[in-house]
Amino acid sequence: SITGISPITESLASLSTYNDQSITFALEDESYEIYVEDLKKDKKKDKVLLSYYESQHPSSESGDGVDGKMLMVTLSPTKDFWLQANNKEHSVELHKCEKPLPDQAFFVLHNRSFNCVSFECKTDPGVFIGVKDNHLALIKVDYSENLGSENILFKLSE
């Protein structure tokens, strides 16, 4: 469960891939599309509002009666629109929605290497936002493998 309904903090940041491609958002036919692309030097990077929430693991999950605290995040590139996981289509979409946000809009934040993060679906543990064919997609990651695979790593820059 998410602790409280308010984020503990928020920040504006641009989102890029491990290979420094930018995540951009474009309004097309009254809906937003998400692109992964190389930006021209002079083009301004799109900013995303990251809202950080705390979430408790049920104590049964941790196996020893001790709750674990996770950091969860929602990502909003423009007012009233949030990134959401579509687990059926294995896709990441932008949807207009009102608060309280659906679970599909929440992602567990994983700090990875020095300056990289990953976003794990709250609704589907082991499934992460990743890059596939120049688009964002949901990618299943085997926990026994290295979670550092580059296609699920993102950089946040203020």
Epitope: T9, Y52, D64, G68, K69, L109, H110, S113
Partner: antibody, heavy 122, light 107 residues
Amino acid sequence: EVQLVESGGGLVQPGGSLRLSCAASGFTFSSYALTWVRQAPGKGLEWVSFISGSGGRPFYADSVKGRFTISRDNSKNMLYLQMNSLRAEDTAIYYCAKSLYTTSWYGGFDSWGQGTLVTVSS
Amino acid sequence: DIQMTQSPSSVSASVGDRVTITCRASQGVVSWLAWYQQKPGKAPKLLIYAASSLQSGVPSRFSGSGSGTDFTLTISSLQPEDFATYYCQQSNSFPFTLGPGTKVDIK
């Protein structure tokens, strides 16, 4: 109740080695990142090293890089700090601490051990 | 590396006083700043994380604020058990760095 208990400190000569241990209990050990922080006598706190829950790529302060190695054994709920080529300026109380969050280091460190004293002197 | 500075380095105050400690980062750390309290001979204790979130079990007279590079720890009404040294720490990027500490002692 979360418990972290450091051991392995003592007196060692300059250039010598020491291995610190931190025994953990009361939480799902492998889910949490851990860190070592030290405090020289009468001085402030200095971050030393960090390791993720899985034991992935560790991080070190410049002052110990190449001399200290952090590691963990998730099957034994143990954290270690191997300290080589010790110098007088490494004299300090060494604390181990666990991260607040299971998947992120952003929240700082919410549980600390009582510390173990390392004295480097001839 | 991100340098952390704290001011004042020490403050003398009386029980009931309002005490404010500031922490400045040499570059932005978003809100990923924690405050710790340490008493002589004891381990540090987490008071505030994410700049303004109160750690479980910490009295509400402690509060934190700020983002980016400038942060503040406030003790609204100093209690006898609050005489200690306070440290800020950024956990936005490696190497993690701590401020030099602010000692709060009895006037």
